[in-house]
C-alpha cells in the first residue's frame, strides 16, 4: 500500500539537490583558499542532518547549528552588502567590486542560493514533490529557517558602514516583512555598526525622483535610528553601469581603487 505523503503548497526539493550542494561546496572551496580546509562531505552530512527525518514545519535554528559551525567563515565585516528584492543586481555588483560581499558570496549562502529542500517526518527521504510554503503552510520550514539563521549571523558579523541595496521600482522600497526588514535590520550590532547606507536603485532611465524621501525609507530610518545606528540613503540612477565591468573585470578601473 503506497504510504500517504503530505502535499505542501510550495515547490518540491530542487532536483539533484545533494549533488548540487556537494558540487557547489567543492567549487567554492577550490576558488576560495581560506575555505580549502572545509570537508564538503561533512558539510553535506550536516546540511542533510538539519532537515532529514524531521517534520518540515518544525525546523529550528538549532537544527542548523552543526552546518553553521562547519561553514564558519570570516568576511571583512566592513565590506558587507545586504540587499532586498534586488538580488541579481547586488550579485552583479559584488562580482565587480570583489572586496564587497553579499550573503550569497559566503560558503553557506552560495550552497543554498536559489535552492529548495525539505524532508519528511520519520523517513530518510527527501521530498521532491512539494515543500511547505512560508505563507500558505508554515514559517518554520527548512528553507526559511536556514535563511533566517544565516542572515542573522551575517548581520551580526557586520561592522562600520554596512550597505544595503534596495529596489526603487517596488511599491514598498523597504519591506519590513522581507528578510532584510525582519531579520538583518534587527541583528546589526549598534556597538559595531556605525552607519547603514541604503542604495535605492532606480529602474527608469529618465527617473529623477528622490526616492530617499519615500515613506518606507523614512520607516527604515526610524527603525535604524532607534537602534542607535546612523542612517544614510543614496539615490542610484544608472543600474546599467553595474554591467560596465562585468564583461571586463580585468579592466583596472573596475576595482575599488579609482
Amino acid at each position: 500500500v503506497p504510504r500517504w505523503r503530505q502535499q505542501w503548497s510550495g515547490p518540491g526539493t530542487t532536483k539533484r539537490f545533494p549533488e548540487t550542494v556537494l558540487a557547489r561546496c567543492v567549487k567554492y572551496t577550490e576558488i576560495h583558499p581560506e575555505m580549502r580546509h572545509v570537508d564538503c562531505q561533512s558539510v553535506w552530512d550536516a546540511f542533510k542532518g538539519a532537515f532529514i527525518s524531521k517534520h518540515p514545519c518544525n525546523i529550528t535554528e538549532e537544527d542548523y547549528q552543526p552546518l553553521m559551525k562547519l561553514g564558519t567563515q570570516t568576511v571583512p565585516c566592513n565590506k558587507i552588502l545586504l540587499w532586498s528584492r534586488i538580488k541579481d543586481l547586488a550579485h552583479q555588483f559584488t562580482q565587480v567590486q570583489r572586496d564587497m560581499f553579499t550573503l550569497e558570496d559566503t560558503l553557506l549562502g552560495y550552497l543554498a542560493d536559489d535552492l529548495t529542500w525539505c524532508g519528511e517526518f520519520n523517513t530518510s527521504k527527501i521530498n521532491y514533490q512539494s515543500c511547505p510554503d512560508w505563507r500558505k503552510d508554515c514559517s518554520n520550514n527548512p528553507v526559511s529557517v536556514f535563511w533566517k539563521t544565516v542572515s542573522r549571523r551575517f548581520a551580526e558579523a557586520a561592522c562600520d558602514v554596512v550597505h544595503v541595496m534596495l529596489n526603487g521600482s517596488r511599491s514598498k522600497i523597504f519591506d519590513k516583512n522581507s528578510t532584510f526588514g525582519s531579520v538583518e535590520v534587527h541583528n546589526l550590532q549598534p556597538e559595531k555598526v556605525q552607519t547603514l547606507e541604503a542604495w535605492v536603485i532606480h529602474g527608469g532611465r529618465e527617473d529623477s525622483r528622490d526616492l530617499c524621501q519615500d515613506p518606507t525609507i523614512k520607516e527604515l530610518e526610524s527603525i535604524i535610528s532607534k537602534r542607535n545606528i546612523q542612517f544614510s540613503c543614496k539615490n542610484i540612477y544608472r543600474p546599467d553601469k553595474f554591467l560596465q565591468c562585468v564583461k571586463n573585470p580585468e579592466d583596472s578601473s573596475c576595482t575599488s581603487e579609482i
Epitope: E206, S208, D210, K241, Q244
Partner: antibody
C-alpha cells in the same frame, strides 16, 4: 594609462555646425558611460551630454537639447559630439570625460579640452 | 533640478584648514564629487562618493555630506592647492549639475 584626446574645435559662425571627436585609450572604452562637459571663458563647468556604454541611452542638458547629438564608435574607441545651430553662448572649451564605475556618476578622467569659438 | 551653491572665494593661510561648502536641497541623498582646476588645465577629481579619495590624491583632501551641505576640507593647505574647486552631483535623467565653483586663495 587612461588617455582622452579631443579634436575638432575651431572658429565657426553662428548657425554653423562642428563635430568634435574624443579618442580614448588605456581602458575598455565600451564598458563606460562617456560625457561632454564645457567651460565658457572665465566661467564654471557645465555638463553637456552623456551616452551609455552601448550608445543606446543619450542624455542632454536643456541648453543643447535638439541642437547637439552625442554618439560613439566602440570599434574605434571614439566619442563624438555633433553640434548644429551653434550660438555665441556655445563658445567654450569642450572636455571629453569618462564616467566613474558602478554607483558613482562623476568624472574620473578628463581630456585636455578643445576650444570652440562661435563668432561672426 | 537641484541647484548647487558654492561660495565664490575662500582664503586660507598656508598650513591651515580650508573648508569649501556646497549646498543643495536634500544633498545628502546624492553622492557628491569634487574637482580641482588650475588655470589652463583640465579639472582633476579629488573626492568622489562624498568622501572617497582617488589614488594619487593627498590625504589632506577629505569630504563629507550631510543635511543639505557637502564640504570639501583641505587640512594643512599648501600653496599648490590654490585653484578653483567645483562640486558636482547627479540627480537622475539629464540632471547632472556642477556648483558655480570656489576660488581658493592660499595667502
Amino acid at each position: 594609462q587612461v588617455q582622452l584626446v579631443e579634436s575638432g574645435g575651431g572658429l565657426v559662425q553662428p548657425g554653423g555646425s562642428l563635430r568634435l571627436s574624443c579618442a580614448a585609450s588605456g581602458f575598455t572604452f565600451s564598458s563606460y558611460y562617456m560625457n561632454w562637459v564645457r567651460q565658457a571663458p572665465g566661467k564654471g563647468l557645465e555638463w553637456v551630454s552623456a551616452i551609455s556604454m552601448d550608445g543606446v541611452y543619450k542624455y542632454y542638458a536643456d541648453s543643447v537639447k535638439g541642437r547637439f547629438t552625442i554618439s560613439r564608435d566602440n570599434s574605434k574607441n571614439t566619442l563624438y559630439l555633433q553640434m548644429n545651430s551653434l550660438r555665441a553662448e556655445d563658445t567654450a572649451v569642450y572636455y571629453c570625460a569618462r564616467d566613474l564605475p558602478l554607483v558613482y556618476t562623476g568624472f574620473a578622467y578628463w581630456g585636455q579640452g578643445t576650444l570652440v569659438t562661435v563668432s561672426s | 533640478d537641484i541647484e548647487l551653491t558654492q561660495p565664490p572665494s575662500v582664503s586660507v593661510a598656508p598650513g591651515q584648514t580650508a573648508r569649501i561648502s556646497c549646498s543643495g536641497d536634500n544633498l545628502r541623498h546624492y553622492y557628491v564629487y569634487w574637482y580641482q582646476q588650475k588655470p589652463g588645465q583640465a579639472p582633476v577629481l579629488v573626492i568622489y562618493g562624498d568622501s572617497k579619495r582617488p589614488s594619487g590624491i593627498p590625504e589632506r583632501f577629505s569630504g563629507s555630506n550631510s543635511g543639505n551641505t557637502a564640504t570639501l576640507t583641505i587640512s594643512g593647505t599648501q600653496a599648490e592647492d590654490e585653484a578653483d574647486y567645483y562640486c558636482q552631483t547627479y540627480t537622475g535623467g539629464a540632471s547632472l549639475v556642477f556648483g558655480g565653483g570656489t576660488k581658493l586663495t592660499v595667502l
